[in-house]
Amino acid sequence: SGTTNTVAAYNLTWKSTNFKTILEWEPKPVNQVYTVQISTKSGDWKSKCFYTTDTECDLTDEIVKDVKQTYLARVFSYPAGNVESTGSAGEPLYENSPEFTPYLETNLGQPTIQSFEQVGTKVNVTVEDERTLVRRNNTFLSLRDVFGKDLIYTLYYWKSSSSGKKTAKTNTNEFLIDVDKGENYCFSVQAVIPSRTVNRKSTDSPVECMGQEKGEFREI
């Protein structure tokens, strides 16, 4: 129930990549505004995005305080221009979000190949260690800092002249692979958290090929 000119938010959805975390919901407001609250299971509610006409709220600053916590959000609906007004039960209408545990659920952003270097029949491929919005001691932590041993990378590589792909895996941000002399190769990488049940893999990085600027070739 509630006042006749407000409707409860619905389809509350967490959109999160590399811990940049936004709560989205419907409907687009007509004569109403929204306020969002977020809490851990054992914590107090904290209000964000006060009396907004947006249908999204950036909650990154709250969830990065402890990415291993489980969070719950709720969206309150108020009549526009009369935010003191409440529903028939004496409280504004609100809807709860699903629970969200950033460490287990944030999407892995598309990785980037930082560089590759060929020395003879070996190629070293380095993946950029992307910065997240998680802080420690006033510095932003990288994806590797946050996920540590839980994060691996998969490398897909193939000869420019063929379509047959090979794969390699690493627990670091570097690969060392064997290649055929005189052949050019193309590379793409994917971030993976094998222990997850959801959002286990990122999208593939842009393809980088030997003979282009990113790499370095040294014949030995």
Epitope: K41, K68, Q69, T70, T101, Y103, L104, V134, R135, R136, L141, D145, V146, F147, G148, K149, N171, T172, P194, S195, R196, T197
Partner: antibody, heavy 121, light 109 residues
Framework: QVQLQESGAEVKKPGASVKVSCKAS????????IEWVRQAPGQGLEWMGE????????KYNEKFKGRVTMTRDTSTSTVYMELSSLRSEDTAVYYC??????????????WGQGTLVTVSS | QAVVTQEPSLTVSPGGTVTLTCRSS?????????ANWVQEKPGHGFKGLIS???NRGPWTTARFSGSILGDKAVLTLWGAHAEDEADYFC?????????FGGGTKLTVL
């Protein structure tokens, strides 16, 4: 505060199985790996395996593969370690442990009090 | 499986500095080994001092410091106290499993 409470001492016969429990409290149970480590009398520490309660993902020490099973019950925030085909060399104190996470850390910060398992005929 | 080696025993004078090392049979220890240092005191059980190479636990005094020195993980204790007398174990991560060292018995004498 973080606590890991293990089950009581067990005496088992060779060939039997033992199931040790580790009840966690004071933190988000699903997000932290629980490690199992044992210490035989007068010996050092030996890692047995780990489980991430949120997904039930496990990794086991090759030495124990086929004999060890780690499970969890999210409703009671409890992790279990079952070791089968017991032999006298399995007599040890069995510990569960959890890391201290502050942006990034992995391993063995918080420890249970240990469960003594004695294998004797 | 890798073998992790520690000094079996070390002695330090009260107020002195001591360095405990943790070597890997597979080569140089790196940050990808997420070196851990665990303290065992009789009657007190186990307590993690350092995890992820250099991250102190909330209870770990600043007198303990973890680092990588050359090809090994190192635990340095400055200004040793009598209560630091204990067994210290290191553990290293190898892609999909942990391996513990044999432990170092530290005597404060």
């Amino acid at each position: 505060q973080v606590q890991l409470q293990e089950s009581g001492a067990e005496v088992k016969k060779p060939g039997a199985s033992v199931k040790v429990s580790c009840k966690a409290s004071g933190y988000t149970f699903s997000s932290y790996w629980i490690e199992w480590v044992r210490q035989a009398p007068g010996q050092g520490l030996e890692w047995m395996g780990e489980i991430l309660p949120g997904s039930a993902s496990t990794k086991y020490n090759e030495k124990f593969k086929g004999r060890v099973t780690m499970t969890r019950d999210t409703s009671t925030s409890t992790v279990y370690m079952e070791l089968s085909s017991l032999r006298s060399e399995d007599t040890a104190v069995y510990y569960c442990a959890r890391d201290y996470y502050y942006g990034s850390s992995y391993g063995f910060a918080y420890w249970g009090q240990g469960t003594l398992v004695t294998v004797s005929s | 499986q890798a073998v992790v080696t520690q000094e079996p025993s070390l002695t330090v004078s009260p107020g002195g500095t001591v360095t405990l090392t943790c070597r890997s049979s597979t080569g140089a220890v790196t940050t990808s080994n997420y070196a851990n240092w665990v303290q065992e005191k009789p009657g007190h059980g186990f307590k993690g001092l350092i995890s992820g190479t250099n991250n102190r636990g909330p209870w770990t005094t600043a007198r303990f410091s973890g680092s990588i020195l050359g090809d090994k993980a190192v635990l340095t204790l400055w200004g040793a106290h009598a209560e630091d007398e204990a067994d210290y174990f290191c553990a290293l991560w190898y892609s999909n499993h942990w391996v513990f060292g044999g432990g170092t018995k530290l005597t404060v004498l």
